[in-house]
């Protein structure tokens, strides 16, 4: 079974890698622009050149290309607490990045929000924090995880996951109430 | 089957609050980020608040930050949203959705909330 292919891709698949067929007339073969420029004009015939123009500035094409624009430079989203790890220029796309002990969480597949690594206070770091993904603690006895902070067993509810981690912690509490001296 | 299925909406008189409730089923809960999103009469959708698995992940809009506060039980496969402080503008159709690469990819029926005087 051959693979679908797209119009473009079928157009592109008959010339050579790094050239196009030109819209107009298919027995032309045009070079593509390189990153960092984009298609002005197609080349008006065999062996003749392109015309291609660097991007302007806040747009850019990564890779060798035949579009007729360049494409907008992202911006990294604050509201995210996104930083700039670099700039856009006219081959790369801005990179956004988190500051230092953050990691990202993804919402989708392209929207990650910042947040703080996990310190694991009242516990110990079983897994560093990562770039994608924030700090596995292990708590300390008469402690239990929630949301990936080490709470104290005291402030564990019979209705809460808690009781299983915590259970020892409980009846110990029982024990030592239900022993009075007599 | 995925289900979500929203309550807790109303009406509400400005400067008061409510607390939407969303029943999942269908899917394992605790593995997914859950959002709230909403639609005003003659509006698009808007994203209002998100909430990773754990429920240590929070977003807000900024339009609600300060006076909604979204949570979970994963014991209870239920995610919430307290609204406090609610105006005339939160005025919307709310939807609870299933988290996924392309934001969500499930959501409820939803439930109405009428802020009015």
């Known amino acids: 079974l051959v693979p679908h292919l797209g119009d473009r891709e079928k157009r592109d698949s008959v010339c050579p890698q790094g050239k196009y067929i030109h819209p107009q007339n298919n027995s032309i073969c045009c070079t593509k622009c390189h990153k960092g420029t984009y298609l002005y004009n197609d080349c008006p015939g065999p062996g003749q050149d392109t015309d291609c123009r660097e991007c302007e500035s806040g747009s850019f094409t990564a890779s060798e290309n035949h579009l007729r624009h360049c494409l907008s430079c992202s911006k990294c989203r604050k509201e995210m607490g996104q930083v700039e790890i670099s700039s856009c220029t006219v081959d790369r796309d801005t990179v956004c990045g988190c500051r230092k002990n953050q990691y990202r969480h993804y919402w989708s597949e392209n929207l990650f929000q910042c947040f703080n690594c996990s310190l694991c206070l009242n516990g110990t770091v079983h897994l560093s924090c990562q770039e994608k993904q924030n700090t596995v603690c292990t708590c300390h006895a008469g402690f239990f995880l929630r949301e990936n902070e080490c709470v104290s067993c005291s402030n564990c509810k019979k209705s809460l996951e808690c009781t299983k981690l915590c259970l020892p912690q409980i009846e110990n509490v029982k024990g030592t109430e239900d022993s009075g001296t007599t | 089957e995925v289900q979500l299925l929203e309550s807790g909406g109303g009406l509400v008189q400005p400067g008061g609050s409510l607390r939407l409730s969303c029943a999942a089923s269908g899917f394992t809960f605790e593995e997914y980020n859950m959002l709230w999103v909403r639609q005003a009469p003659g509006k698009g959708l808007e994203w209002v608040s998100g909430?990773?698995?754990?429920?240590?992940?929070?977003y807000y809009a900024d339009s609600v930050k300060g006076r909604f506060t979204i949570s979970r039980d994963n014991s209870k496969n239920t995610l919430y949203l307290q609204m406090n402080s609610l105006r005339a503008e939160d005025t919307a159709v709310y939807y609870c959705?299933?988290?996924?690469?392309?934001?969500?990819?499930?959501w409820g029926q939803g439930t109405l909330v009428t802020v009015s005087s």
């Open positions: 959705a299933k988290g996924s690469i392309t934001l969500f990819d499930y």
């Open positions: 909430i990773g698995p754990s429920g240590r992940e929070t």
